[in-house]
Amino acid sequence: QPEQKTLSLPGTYRHVDRTTGQVLTCDKCPAGTYVSEHCTNMSLRVCSSCPAGTFTRHENGIERCHDCSQPCPWPMIERLPCAALTDRECICPPGMYQSNGTCAPHTVCPVGWGVRKKGTENEDVRCKQCARGTFSDVPSSVMKCKAHTDCLGQNLEVVKPGTKETDNVCGMRLFFSSTNPPSSGTVTFSHPEHMESHDVPSSTYEPQGMNSTDSNSTASVRTKVPSGIEEGTVPDNTSSTSGKEGTNRTLPNPPQVTHQQAPHHRHILKLLPSSMEATGEKSSTAIKAPKRGHPRQNAHKHFDINEH
């Protein structure tokens, strides 16, 4: 109903009784209700509860409650339900963020890159290239670069130096008499975490278009998360999208990684005399779910002169 747009005392609103033309000051109704009958010269205003599917957030002088926002479109989930006091609020599920009104999967930082800033339901993950002394051997949207294993600290020696993509391989050499060399050398090495076997390409993976010295870049590979993938697993990379933050950087798809978790045990590697290379790589599969940030308020906003 058309109202006189003048200021009124806190807790009151101005109402024009259109039948008489009189401007009246009425008490507002509490949040979760609306004015079902305005005050008159003779009577107080009457408040009624907001019917299902509607709400009012504040005390108000409005004649009908606001309609709640539409049910959350897939894949969004409800953060707040539609209730008398609150509008429905939709957010992106864990592992996704809000972009152009829908949910996009968090960027998966490729091998050799780690999470610089965790993603939230409103912000994408920021990736950075692993610095010297750190590595990331799995594509992940939640894992930071990990420090190379300190072999010396474990009274072991570095059998194979780590890279941005692999951990140090530690080993303990067993020396034999030079007069009786064994047919094959033996190196033992230990990792305090689960061992995983990986299909690793022979060439070192260097994301194109990224300066290898730039440790604060935002990687632009976004791995699409197939529906039905469980939280806490690292999905396969199936596609990529172009750069973010105004830098037209692009990355090729990171290499495919097959995760096969092995039991926790020491590995004994038989090394042929011609080669002292160990191929075991260390990785952690304890992936934490992304933290939730502060979601953007629902776009469905209401303003009414008599509600504030």
């Epitope: 006189q4 009784d17 259109r18 008489t20 033309g21 009189q22 009908r64």
Partner: antibody
């Protein structure tokens, strides 16, 4: 009791302006909105706009913006409707009303060459 | 603008009859409707406001009903002074709009 006394009939030439008055009595003039309504024979009723003398807040029907001007003089408890650039379409009876219940007796405006 | 469709546009009735005039709003207007009476050559008199509330001094044979978009004015036991034009008016939304009117004539 509440009374709205309107000015007498007007005859005007096309292109001219007229200013109609509505003197209120029997209530506090600045506490109530006053509306103006146009009635043309065979054309039904049209709401022109309203004024709140308490702060001179006005609201017009889009159709009458630029054609009608509403004012009020609180010292004499009188509301005014000025119609400009008159045409034959403006020939009608004009009523002032307080809300939808109290009505003035109407003023006939005739626009003729 | 809200269109108020009033019917019938005219009706011939006899003294003592009961008549109903209806008004349909093009959208819901809750109960923000009034009914007016106009006698030939005269001004308007407010009969009913808020769809159902009778104005002071108006005989109880006038009753208003309806809510939302469909409303009616019923006059029971018609008397000679009731023969006039009747209009509905909505004041839920600017601009206020009126029905086309119903002319009540003696049969």
């Amino acid at each position: 009791q509440v009374q709205l006394q309107q000015s007498g009939p007007e005859v005007a030439r096309p292109g001219a302006s007229v200013k109609l008055s509505c003197k209120a009595s029997g209530y506090t003039f600045t506490d109530y909105y006053l509306n103006w309504v146009k009635q043309r024979t065979g054309q039904g009723l049209e709401w022109i706009g309203e004024i709140y003398p308490g702060n001179n807040h006005t609201y017009y029907n889009e159709k009458f913006k630029g054609k009608a001007t509403l004012t009020a003089d609180n010292s004499s408890s009188t509301a005014y409707l000025q119609f400009s650039s008159l045409t034959s379409e403006d020939s009608a009876v004009y009523f002032c009303t307080r809300g939808v219940i109290k009505w003035g007796q109407g003023t006939l405006v005739t626009v003729s060459v | 603008d809200i269109l108020m469709t009033q019917s019938p546009s005219s009706m011939s009735v006899s003294l003592g009859d009961t008549v109903s005039i209806t008004c349909h709003a093009s959208q819901g207007i809750r109960n923000s409707i009034g009914w007016l009476q106009q006698k030939p050559g005269k001004s308007f008199k407010g009969l009913i406001y808020h769809a159902t509330t009778l104005e002071d001094g108006v005989p109880s044979r006038f009753t208003g009903s309806g809510s939302g978009a469909d409303f009616s004015l019923t006059i029971s036991s018609l008397e000679s002074e009731d023969f006039a034009d009747y209009y509905c008016v909505q004041y839920a939304q600017f601009p206020y709009t009126f029905g086309g009117g119903t002319k009540l004539e003696i049969k």
